[in-house]
């Protein structure tokens, strides 16, 4: 039961995380105008990965896309790439994890296959989350660097009297969305990997107790040691796997001479 819950929760957390990464990537507010020097500006600037926008106090908002690839800073291109890689990996991870979910039965899929798929999706979520966190962090670092650079030459005097104020940018909402979303995807991935460990087929050291109705004596099912020892009825060395959430009745075993009266 715990494994199914962990896997399910990991999937949901990752799903929310990836949705957040997509939202952050599409958002225009990666950087927003710093209003420290002019809190009542009539023109507010903000920028995203794909376009920059200007919102006037009049309510009019104008957004312009970055219609160039070569003219953009390499760091911005890198952030775009990281976010897209994160989304693609996350999307593939989600697709894989849907089929890996223990609560979903697809044909006669082996539990070992589900375990492998869970691990694969978990790793994908972890990498996806790391990509998003890295992308957002690179952009944040770029902002911090530019912020202090523009602060250094905040006012460039013109004729002594006239001032030209350089627009400074600070962290936008998308950065926080990206960090949280990346973290959630990462946590979801870790949960999937933990769930995979619980799903992984391992030989159990004992089998379920079986009873027969002949008289008052109780016959115990032999075996239960490792298959390689040759003890018990599991002569085919078939792995017996307890999914962690099965009842005694559901445990797979092959019949022995003691099983039927």
């Amino acid at each position: 039961m715990a494994v199914t819950a962990c896997q399910g929760l990991g999937f949901v957390v990752s799903l929310i995380g990836i949705a957040g990464i997509i939202a952050a990537t599409c958002m225009d507010q990666w950087s927003t105008q710093d209003l420290y020097n002019n809190p009542v500006t009539a023109v507010f600037n903000y920028q995203g990965l794909w376009r920059s926008c200007v919102r006037e106090s009049s309510g009019f908002t104008e957004c312009r896309g970055y219609f160039t690839l070569l003219g953009l800073p390499a760091m911005l291109q890198a952030v775009r790439a990281l976010m897209i890689v994160g989304i693609v990996l996350g999307a593939i991870g989600l697709l894989v994890s849907i089929f890996a979910l223990k609560c979903i039965r697809i044909g006669s899929m082996e539990d070992s296959a589900k375990a492998n798929m869970t691990l694969t999706s978990g790793i994908m979520f972890i990498v996806s989350g790391l990509c998003a966190i890295a992308g957002v962090s690179v952009f944040a670092n770029m902002l911090v660097t530019n912020f202090w650079m523009s602060t250094a030459n905040m006012y460039t005097g013109m004729g002594g009297m006239v001032q030209t104020v350089q627009t400074r940018y600070t962290f936008g909402a998308a950065l926080f969305v990206g960090w949280v979303a990346g973290g959630l995807t990462l946590i979801g991935g870790v949960m999937m990997c933990i769930a995979c460990r619980g799903l992984a087929p391992e030989e159990t050291n004992y089998k379920a107790v079986s009873y027969h109705a002949s008289g008052h004596s109780v016959a115990y099912k032999p075996g239960g040691f490792k298959a390689s020892t040759g003890f018990g009825s599991n002569t085919k060395n078939k792995k017996i796997y307890d999914g962690g959430a099965r009842t005694e009745d559901e445990v797979q075993s092959y019949p022995s001479k003691h099983d039927y009266v």
Epitope: V40, A42, S57, S58, F60, Q163
Partner: antibody
Framework: DVQLVESGGGLVQPGGSRKLSCAAS????????MHWIRQTPEKGLEWVAY????????YYADTVKGRFTISRDNPKNTLFLQMTSLRSEDTAMYFC???????????WGQGTLVTVSA | DIVMTQSPSFLTVTAGEKVTMSCRSS????????????LTWYQQKPGQPPKLLIY???TRESGVPDRFTGSGSGTDFTLTISSVQAEDLALYYC?????????FGAGTKLELK
């Protein structure tokens, strides 16, 4: 056709109060920020107050801050300016204006005259 | 606050003449985000409210004759009337539309010679 009609002006004693109204028609009032601007022969045009379409944010000129209150009633398509502690320097023609592209005022009312005098 | 300085205060012209009036701001009105200058020009005739002529320093409002042209960037702006008509005789104001408080120039009065 866009129309803005101010009312409520008149003679007021120093320290007194007055409430100006601006009735809007011919456009979706709730979709535009609105302003009060005043004009005197001495000072020329002077911006007084701004209220956004959703009533937040609100900005005031330092000269009227704490004394004047701008408000709006979107369902009734009306803009208000509550003026208190009036001074002689508040004597002016008061215009309401609609906020437009480029933070400009594209439509103005005809104005209402407020005279603060003993 | 941004201070707007207009010059000259009075301008005496003859009909058909080309006229230029100046407006200077104490701070740049150029917004780096969209490379637009937040300066507006208005025309006011006696007994009337101001009328919007030009916004974003050079964008003519619909219905404004094309003889009115706005130019300039940063802190220095100009309003040009290519061929003055009798109906153009009025007061012309420039306005800072970049930051609150929104400030106006003292105006340039266009008079007939």
């Amino acid at each position: 056709d866009v129309q803005l009609v101010e009312s409520g002006g008149g003679l007021v004693q120093p320290g007194g109060s007055r409430k100006l109204s601006c009735a809007a028609s011919g456009f979706t009032f709730s979709g535009f920020g609105m302003h009060w601007i005043r004009q005197t022969p001495e000072k020329g045009l002077e911006w007084v107050a701004y209220i956004s379409s959703g009533s937040r944010p609100i900005y005031y000129a330092d000269t009227v801050k704490g004394r004047f209150t701008i408000s709006r009633d979107n369902p009734k398509n009306t803009l208000f300016l509550q003026m208190t502690s009036l001074r002689s320097e508040d004597t002016a023609m008061y215009f309401c204006a609609r906020f437009y592209y480029g933070n400009s005022f594209d439509h103005w009312g005809q104005g209402t005259l407020v005279t603060v005098s003993a | 606050d941004i201070v707007m300085t207009q010059s000259p205060s009075f301008l005496t012209v003859t009909a058909g003449e080309k006229v230029t009036m100046s407006c200077r701001s104490s701070q740049s009105l150029l917004n780096s985000g969209n490379q637009k200058n937040y300066l507006t020009w208005y025309q006011q005739k006696p007994g009337q409210p101001p009328k919007l002529l030009i916004y974003w320093a050079s964008t003519r409002e619909s219905g404004v004759p094309d003889r009115f042209t706005g130019s300039g960037s940063g802190t220095d702006f100009t309003l040009t009337i290519s061929s003055v008509q009798a109906e153009d005789l009025a007061l012309y104001y420039c306005q800072n539309a970049y930051s609150f408080p929104l400030t106006f120039g003292a105006g340039t009065k266009l008079e007939l010679k």
